[in-house]
């Protein structure tokens, strides 16, 4: 009686179970009563990453340099090429099909996490006691100057964008 289901890494065809091709290989011909499944390795710049019955391998992804992409990991017969972006740029999606500039954190905001090839700069507002007076992709919020430790007093309060201004203590004569 012909099978209705096959084991793992097999497929049903013409009422019989044939072996799937292993990753990195494509199907040339199905098995028969007398022969095994015939598979062939994927060619240069091609891959298949699963046990399969595909008759064509997939082309490796092209990391288009005109889009700012470069190869992070070269593809193999079993894996696709992984692209990343040039320094100063990051991928617009997980698939990394194009790149955008790293954003800067505006004054009043500091860098919480520096950008990478796959993620943008993460900014955070400077909390009370901290400031940032520049637009930067690297600078964290800086703590206000401690006037007391310099034996000075606060002459002008700090904000999230400006440091405190220290001045001499009034001397009683």
């Amino acid at each position: 009686e012909p099978p209705t289901a096959c084991r793992e890494k097999q497929y049903l065809i013409n009422s019989q179970c044939c072996s799937l091709c292993q990753p990195g290989q494509k199907l040339v011909s199905d098995c028969t009563e007398f022969t095994e499944t015939e598979c062939l390795p994927c060619g240069e710049s091609e891959f298949l990453d699963t046990w399969n019955r595909e008759t064509h391998c997939h082309q490796h992804k092209y990391c288009d340099p005109n889009l700012g992409l470069r190869v992070q990991q070269k593809g193999t017969s079993e894996t696709d090429t992984i692209c990343t972006c040039e320094e100063g740029w990051h991928c617009t999606s997980e698939a990394c099909e194009s790149c955008v500039l790293h954003r800067s954190c505006s004054p009043g905001f500091g860098v919480k996490q520096i950008a990478t090839g796959v993620s943008d700069t993460i900014c955070e507002p400077c909390p009370v006691g901290f400031f940032s007076n520049v637009s930067s992709a690297f600078e964290k919020c800086h703590p206000w100057t401690s006037c007391e430790t310099k034996d000075l007093v606060v002459q002008q309060a700090g904000t999230n964008k400006t440091d405190v201004v220290c001045g001499p203590q009034d001397r009683l004569r």
């Epitope: 340099p65 005109n66 889009l67 700012g68 100063g88 617009t92 500039l101």
Partner: antibody, heavy 112, light 112 residues
Framework: QSVEESGGRLVTPGTPLTLTCTVS????????MSWVRQAPGKGLEWIGI?????FAVYANWAKGRFTISKASTTVDLKLPSPTTEDTATYFC?????????WGPGTLVTVSS | DIVMTQTPASVEAAVGDTVTIKCQAS??????LAWYQQKPGQPPKLLIY???TLESGVPSRFKGSGSGTEFTLTISDLECADAATYYC??????????????FGGGTEVVVK
Amino acid sequence: QSVEESGGRLVTPGTPLTLTCTVSGFSLSTYAMSWVRQAPGKGLEWIGIIDGGGFAVYANWAKGRFTISKASTTVDLKLPSPTTEDTATYFCARGVTFFNLWGPGTLVTVSS
Amino acid sequence: DIVMTQTPASVEAAVGDTVTIKCQASQSISSALAWYQQKPGQPPKLLIYRASTLESGVPSRFKGSGSGTEFTLTISDLECADAATYYCQSYYYSSGGSYDYAFGGGTEVVVK
């Protein structure tokens, strides 16, 4: 795929000017575009770049002197207060770290 | 800012000769360097990017090499059509988060 600049003309110093780069055959949401200029008989000078998301960065010397913005098929370069030193041919160029597609350029002459 | 020093400013050579143009960066730019050819009245044309990768359609007579701060463009079997000005262009993203695109001063190649 092509890019073409327009808007170049003779202006007096301080007269605001907007140059436009019109692209066809590719998407500005994917590609970055730069403005580069060339004074008569001189070399090339990078002004700034705008990415697919519309974020722009500028050369240190160009900050505050130029503004780059974009729409669906155009990239604008605004010169809010040009001086005689801004006399040049202005090119629009596509690319991230290098530029593989350039327009023919548009000539800006600033003279009193 | 990065400064690109290009030498020589001008070179004269005969058809069939080999011409070498050098470009020196004021600090290391890894391999982020491109070479362009510009003829009078035309925009620059990309020849080589990433220091040594030949742009599609560019004859293999053009060869780029180098990394770090020293780069070379070699034109072999010189042809009349190679008479032009050649520019190097660097890209650098600094640790301060600024973007720097710099062009060399150009080299005029005269073909005898």
